[in-house]
């Protein structure tokens, strides 16, 4: 045996953002032929000896960081990247607004504001299909996400979440969707390969994206760290990226 065994992948299906009481499956995947897996919940000293953890109803206590490894012979693999399992709907939804408004001319500026009645110091902005994060200034009770020099690519549906840095895996419900419309351009923005969003399809978690792979990234401006929160990395070339732009206090 030369060098350590390669790390497995750990993913949450359908998503690592899980509404309370909804199901989620954590799956650890190593090389073919491996059948001895250990799935750990960090900061709780607990583990199980299965590659798959099915959670029929998401609970607050199950939110947190997970990691897995496998054993081959007497050797342990490197650990997987950590997966951050987030419980959503723990708190009331914030409101998301656009200033000066949700219709903006191409080349203009717009600021998306996520506001909560709680004293939360963390906000996450999510745009369907958006490939890159924004830089975020900070505000208490409110997060401003300025978009400078708007282009057609900024068109789309946005939602935001609020949460506390003291409980970083317990998030609010998603805000109502905000449709940002960029006028004065004929370029059609890229969209999800599914039907248009609807209020019933709760940010597509339970419907359109069930069979779509995606990569989530959480960006914390305070520490400039990037974490893969639902790392289904390369199975679906056509899959949209869901971005979370986290603004920390």
């Amino acid at each position: 045996q030369s060098g350590p065994l390669p790390k497995p992948s750990l993913q949450a299906l359908p998503s690592s953002l899980v509404p309370l009481e909804k199901p989620v499956t954590l799956r650890c995947q190593g090389p073919p032929g491996v059948d001895l897996y250990r799935l750990e919940k960090l900061s709780s000293s607990r583990y199980q000896d299965q590659a798959v953890l099915f959670i029929p109803a998401m609970k607050r206590s199950l939110a947190g960081r997970y990691r897995c490894s496998y054993q081959n012979g007497s050797l342990w693999s490197l650990p997987s990247d950590q997966l951050e399992l987030v419980a959503t709907g723990v708190f009331a939804k914030p409101s998301l607004s656009a200033q000066p408004g949700p219709a903006v001319s191409s080349g203009g500026d717009v600021t998306l504001q996520c506001q909560t009645r709680y004293g939360f110091d963390q906000f996450a902005l999510y745009k369907e299909g958006d490939p890159a994060p924004y830089k975020n200034p900070e505000r208490w009770y409110r997060a401003s996400f300025p978009i400078i020099t708007v282009t057609a690519a900024h068109s789309g549906t946005y939602r935001c979440y609020s949460f506390s840095s003291r409980d970083p895996y317990l998030w609010s419900a998603p805000s109502d969707p905000l449709e940002l419309v960029v006028t004065g351009t004929s370029v059609t923005p890229s969209r999800l390969p599914t039907e248009p969003p609807s209020p019933v399809a709760e940010f597509s978690e339970a419907t359109a994206e069930l069979t779509v792979s995606f990569t989530n990234e959480v960006f914390t401006t305070e520490t400039s760290r990037s974490i893969t929160a639902s790392p289904k990395e390369s199975d679906s070339p056509a899959g949209p990226a869901r971005q979370y732009y986290t603004k920390g206090n």
Epitope: R38, L42, S43, S44, Y47, Q48, D49, L53, Q71, S74
Partner: antibody, heavy 123, light 111 residues
């Protein structure tokens, strides 16, 4: 109530072998990870080996790997430690310990310990 | 040499407060693994005292408390009593080879 009773300790010459047993009662033995932990005279605790609830996952401390073998018999509610090529530094009290378990989850700590059995390796 | 580092001894007078530190590394305590504490009274087997950094099993007095921060942890004992004289061990898990690791132990003397 939970009981763990170790046996099989004694005096053995360097290079010799010994088999320790741990009889478990008062709980569902087959649900729990089990470990052997030792304590040399006047020294601290040292984890030796652990075995998964079904006997699949097995881990050893580097100091005993290749010489000691842990096993379990769930039908007999028993844990074993086969010790070969014994050395003077293996002299210790050997404890059998149960890992805590709750629902489907195992935990990385020991909630019950036996009283221990003394192994002395000396010529 | 133990993977987790504890002071060899601490002491205090009855009624006082003492703390015992436990220092690990990025592959054990700092890797997200909890710290657990055991009390070993003279001539007896170790007994679980604190699990999951700060939780007490039933029957353990609330004079005993634990905390964890970064790559280290500590055990605090308030209102020291003569019967607290014992050896105290911290324990965690190490990610490298999935091994259980202990501190070298701290002997508490009640003056």
């Amino acid at each position: 109530q939970v009981q763990l009773v170790e046996s099989g300790g004694g005096l053995v010459k360097p290079g010799g072998s010994l088999r320790l047993s741990c009889a478990a009662s008062g709980f569902s033995f087959s649900d729990h990870y089990m470990s052997w932990i030792r304590q040399a005279p006047g020294k601290g605790l040292e984890w030796v080996s652990s075995v998964g609830s079904e006997g699949k996952f097995i881990d050893y401390a580097a100091s005993v790997k290749g010489r000691f073998t842990i096993s379990r018999d769930n039908a007999k509610n028993s844990l074993y430690l086969q010790m070969n090529s014994l050395r003077a530094e293996d002299t210790a009290v050997y404890y059998c310990a149960r890992h805590y378990r709750e629902f489907r989850w195992h935990y990385y700590y020991f909630d019950y310990w036996g009283q221990g059995t003394l192994v002395t390796v000396s010529s | 040499q133990s993977v987790l580092t504890q002071p060899p001894s601490v002491s205090g007078a009855p009624g006082q407060r003492v703390t015992i530190s436990c220092t690990g590394s990025s592959s054990n305590i700092g890797a997200g693994y909890d710290v657990h504490w055991y009390q070993q009274l003279p001539g007896t087997a170790p007994k679980l005292l604190i699990y999951g950094n700060s939780n007490r099993p039933s029957g353990v007095p609330d004079r005993f408390s634990g905390s964890k921060s970064g790559t280290s942890a500590s055990l605090a004992i308030t209102g020291l009593q003569a019967e607290d004289e014992a050896d105290y061990y911290c324990q965690s898990h190490d990610l490298g080879a999935h091994v259980w690791v202990f501190g070298g132990g701290t002997k508490l003397t009640v003056l």
